[in-house]
Interface confidence: medium
């Protein structure tokens, strides 16, 4: 065998074993997602999490993992079987995702004041309507999951929920916001958490009960709540986070490009396909 | 820090027009709407009106309308009202106040454009 | 127009003295009022939004309360830098309204 060969053999296996890994990989995130989908309760029990947006981690979950199955089994059938179709195929799909990926991080440099506007629109909207439209649980959720891990509460501050007619206390009452602006280790008191469900979301029965978010806390004391809006918790996470976030992107387009450039010599370097496709038949 | 810098006092004369600046520095200028309000001599407050810098929508108090104009530059984080046709009542201070959104209270604000109005 | 009538329009207090000052709205502004606190020479300062939610830095001794068309501004003690103009605003409609503002004096 030549080095030439045992090179190409190694590449084989190589691609093989890592695109087996990922595939794997690609099955577990799915059976996640169709997890959650299926069954939510056990799942937030399984977790042990409070205001998971499910929602939409079920969908991107599920599709995210068909998606990363479907690249990772052309490139492990595409290296064990030497298919050029197949390898071209699994080279196309990683290229398009990287060009994707670069894109996106163009977009997000250059576009920076469109987007913090285009997300301030969109949790203005969420919270302007929350609780009011059983469509609208996905965002609901995915906010309130944001408030609860950053600790904060609002857009620029925690009254931004007060506008919110349906959330504002008539009369003497206190103000509402969702619970999920609760600073929980700021009071022992259990009973501080006065959770009113919306009558609205009565009507959608156990389903909107059982969801975090839909649980609407009296404010009878600021301290007890997250003072900060999530504006400056947004920015302020990026800013702890943004060398773990290069790295991450760093990390993933180098892997893809590691992959592309072994599918490629791959391809490159194997038989015509016809003779390939002869020694199986 | 947050700070809203204002240009400096005015006299102008009656039929006149003035244009009073209000630069934004230590938060994102686009995110937070710009709000102007009037204060005469002696007199109470008076909202004037206020700006979405981000995109340019105004709204005006309709004593107002037609003689206050408001405008923005974002490249320089700064908010304008300009006062055309002035009269001896138009003589107050000035300030620009900055607002999450239209609907809210007023945080930050600058600290007031004298314009006098005198002949 | 949404009227905001402050009460009283002048008043004089000593150093420690509980001080209410209180604005009427002509209709119901949903706890959309803020409080103000202006000095000589000064640009205003927000102390209270939202009726009863202080404003950050704003000390403790500052409360307000309230709901439909009657609310309340409270400072618990008076300190000699509480002496100042006080202004009530509706920001439920516009346009937005002030109130003619409460003086408080050193008796």
């Known amino acids: 065998m030549s080095a030439q060969e045992s090179c190409l053999s190694l590449i084989k296996y190589f691609l093989f074993v890592f695109n087996l890994f990922f595939f794997v990989l690609g099955s577990l995130i799915f059976c996640f997602g169709i997890w959650i989908l299926i069954d939510k309760t056990s799942f937030v029990s399984f977790v042990g999490l409070a205001f998971v947006p499910l929602q939409i981690w079920s969908k991107v979950l599920a599709i995210s993992g068909i998606f990363t199955m479907g690249i990772a089994l052309l490139g492990c059938v595409g290296a064990l079987k030497e298919l050029r179709c197949l390898l071209g195929l699994y080279f196309g799909m990683l290229l398009l995702l990287f060009a994707t990926q670069i894109t996106l991080g163009i977009l997000i440099s250059t576009q920076r004041a469109q987007l913090e506007r285009s997300l301030r629109d969109v949790v203005e909207k969420t919270i302007q309507k929350y609780g009011t439209n059983p469509e609208e649980t996905a965002a609901e959720e995915s906010w309130d999951y944001v408030q609860f891990q950053l600790r904060c509460c609002g857009w620029h501050y925690p009254q931004d929920w007060f506008q919110v007619l349906i959330l504002r206390g008539n009369g003497s009452e206190a103000h509402r916001v969702p619970c999920s602006c609760y600073n929980l280790s700021a009071t022992n008191d259990s009973t501080i958490l006065d959770k009113v469900i919306l009558p609205q979301l009565s009507r959608l029965g156990h389903l909107a009960r059982s969801r975090h978010s839909a649980d609407i806390c009296a404010v009878p004391a600021e301290s007890h709540i997250y003072r900060e809006g999530c504006a400056q918790g947004l920015q302020k996470w990026l800013h702890n986070n943004l060398i773990s976030i290069v790295g991450i992107c760093l990390g993933v387009g180098l892997l893809e490009l590691g992959f592309m450039t072994l599918s490629i010599f791959l391809c490159r370097n194997l038989d015509h396909v016809y003779n390939r496709l002869a020694r199986y038949r | 820090q947050i700070q809203l810098v204002q240009s400096g006092a005015e006299v102008v004369k009656p039929g006149a027009s003035v244009k009073v600046s209000c630069k934004a520095s230590g938060y994102s200028f686009t995110d937070y709407n710009m709000y102007w309000v009037k204060q005469a001599p002696g007199q109470r407050l008076e909202w004037m009106g206020y700006i979405d810098p981000y995109n340019g929508d105004t709204t005006y108090n309709q004593k107002f309308k037609g003689r206050a104009t408001i405008t923005r530059d974002t490249s320089a984080s700064t908010a304008y009202i300009e006062l055309s046709s002035l009269r001896s009542e138009d003589t107050a201070v000035y300030y620009c106040a900055r607002s999450p959104y239209g609907h809210y209270a007023m945080d930050y604000w600058g600290q007031g454009t004298l314009v006098t109005v005198s002949s | 127009d949404i009227q905001m009538t402050q009460s009283p329009s002048s008043l004089s207090a000593s150093v420690g003295d509980r001080v209410t000052i209180t604005c009427k709205a002509s209709q119901d502004v949903s706890t959309a009022v803020d409080w103000y606190q202006q000095k000589p020479g000064k640009a205003p300062k927000l102390l209270i939004n939202?009726?009863?939610t202080r404003h950050t830095g704003v000390p403790s001794r500052f409360s307000g309360s309230g709901s439909g068309t009657d609310y309340t501004l409270t400072i618990s003690s008076m300190q000699p830098e509480d002496f100042a103009t006080y202004y009530c605003?509706?920001?439920?409609?516009?346009?937005?309204?002030f109130g003619q503002g409460t003086k408080l004096e050193i008796k």
């Open positions: 939202w009726a009863s």
């Open positions: 605003r509706q920001h439920y409609s516009t346009p937005f309204t």
